[in-house]
């Protein structure tokens, strides 16, 4: 159940897709990736207030219990709902290969 | 890639499965669920230090970028990797039904 997309905290404050520019050095990939030299990393960042983009029943439970026991149960967390594939040109023992990664870049986000 | 299961923060501090006892009232279910009266809710709670139970490449990237830009990029978050199904006896317009929910109880956890 993809619940409300209205953010009660104000525009851009709730769970959504952000883009962060990162170099191979930033990512710790310089020793095994040749290209790209820089990646536009899409990731899920933001707060998950009550029922905002609740991924499933578990997220709804978590919201309820967090309200009751905030010190014990954390609020739901903003994480990828799906991913966009990405290729990397990576070093191998014998040279290079073009490798596809399916779990690297967030495509959209939800709260869980 | 299911990375290290050793918690550098000390026993029980890192992302793992916890059980929280909750009543129907706690969950806000009293008006539509008849049974069970109380649920042993399993959920994922705990810190996600560097590479601890990293769910995938995205989690590894997030760890690297959080280290570089802690104010911009949050650390990975402890969320369910899979779920255990659960049945609820719920009220209907005509009486009751037995309904299975596949996304209610966390089965195991990872960091993403």
């Amino acid at each position: 159940a993809r619940n409300g997309d209205h953010c009660p905290l104000g525009p851009g404050r709730c769970c959504r897709l952000h883009t962060v520019r990162a170099s191979l050095e930033d990512l710790g990939w310089a020793d095994w990736v040749l290209s790209p030299r820089e990646v536009q990393v899409t990731m899920c960042i933001g707060a998950c207030p009550s029922q905002f983009r609740a991924a499933n029943m578990h997220a709804q439970i978590k919201t309820s219990l967090h309200r009751l026991k905030p010190d014990t149960v954390p609020a739901p967390c903003c994480v990828p709902a799906s991913y966009n594939p990405m290729v990397l040109i990576q070093k191998t023992d014998t040279g290079v290969s073009l490798q596809t990664y399916d779990d690297l870049l967030a495509k959209d986000c939800h709260c869980i | 890639a299911r990375n290290g299961d050793h918690c550098p923060l000390g026993p029980g501090r890192c992302c793992r499965l916890h059980t929280v006892r909750a009543s129907l009232e706690d969950l806000g279910w009293a008006d539509w669920v008849l049974s069970p009266r109380e649920v042993q809710v399993t959920m994922c709670i705990g810190a996600c230090p560097s590479q601890f139970r990293a769910a995938n490449m995205h989690a590894q990237i997030k760890t690297s970028l959080h280290r570089l830009k802690p104010d911009t990029v949050p650390a990975p978050c402890c969320v369910p990797a899979s779920y255990n199904p659960m049945v609820l006896i719920q009220k209907t317009d005509t009486g009751v039904s037995l309904q299975t929910y596949d996304d209610l109880l966390a089965k195991d956890c990872h960091c993403i």
């Epitope: 040749l34 290209s35 790209p36 536009q40 966009n84 594939p85 990405m86 290729v87 990397l88 040109i89 290079v96 073009l98 596809t100 690297l104 870049l105 | -």
Partner: antibody, heavy 118, light 107 residues
């Protein structure tokens, strides 16, 4: 398994236009870092890069031919198109499409022959 | 545009011989040079990336080196299936440009 197949070649009148298609399988143009390029080879000559299009719809063109070229993609159909206007005899060539991963062109089609003649 | 000048334009050699082809860029391209093999009536085959990295499945008798403006492609021991035309290409900046090709023929 990656395959590319060019089509749309044949006889074209000077001054006319040609539209080539590159149908591919084994990869997706919605994948970050992936592109499709066009390269041609005149009879008995070397290779000449024409244009390429990226997953994010960024496009790059051969400087000398830029005004005559259009490149586009239909991601859902796994097809890339190259249109060339105002063709002349020197555009006679085998036209290849190739898969690109950043600056690698690792898989090529078998080519389609274009002859410009009246 | 960056001009890639390849030499020689053709060479004759025998099976087992060592073959060296050179490519000169009109400006500094760092290590951004690729090499391709093309047999008659066939499409080019990608061999070397970024001056010296063999692509997946390419035999180790093929190698490349160089940086800046001067690049070398070597076949350490020519096999019968290696007789073909070889092209260098700069992938430093668009427009990407190819060398004129080197035809490796049987002596």
């Amino acid at each position: 398994q990656v395959t590319l197949l060019e089509s749309g070649g044949g006889l074209v009148q000077p001054g006319g236009s040609l539209r080539l298609s590159c149908s591919f399988s084994g990869f997706s143009l919605s994948t970050y870092g992936i592109g499709v390029g066009w390269i041609r080879q005149a009879p008995g000559k070397g290779l000449e890069w024409l244009a390429h299009i990226w997953w994010n719809n960024n496009k790059y063109f051969n400087t000398a031919l830029k005004s005559r070229l259009t490149i586009s993609k239909d991601t859902s159909k796994n097809t890339v198109y190259l249109q060339m206007n105002s063709v002349r005899a020197e555009d006679t060539a085998v036209y290849y499409c190739a898969r690109m991963g950043y600056d690698i062109m690792d898989y090529w089609g078998q080519g389609t022959t274009v002859t410009v003649s009246s | 545009d960056i001009v890639m000048t390849q030499s020689p334009s053709s060479l004759s050699t025998s099976v087992g011989d060592r073959v060296t082809i050179t490519c000169k860029a009109s400006q500094d391209v760092n290590t951004a040079v690729a090499w391709y093999q093309q047999k008659p009536g066939k499409s080019p085959k990608f061999l070397i990336y970024s001056s010296s990295y063999r692509y997946t499945g390419v035999p180790d008798r093929f190698s490349g080196s160089g940086s800046g403006t001067d690049f070398t492609f070597t076949i350490s021991s020519v096999q019968p299936e290696d007789f073909a035309v070889y092209y260098c290409q700069q992938h430093y900046s668009t427009p990407w440009t190819f060398g004129g090709g080197t035809k490796v023929e049987i002596k």
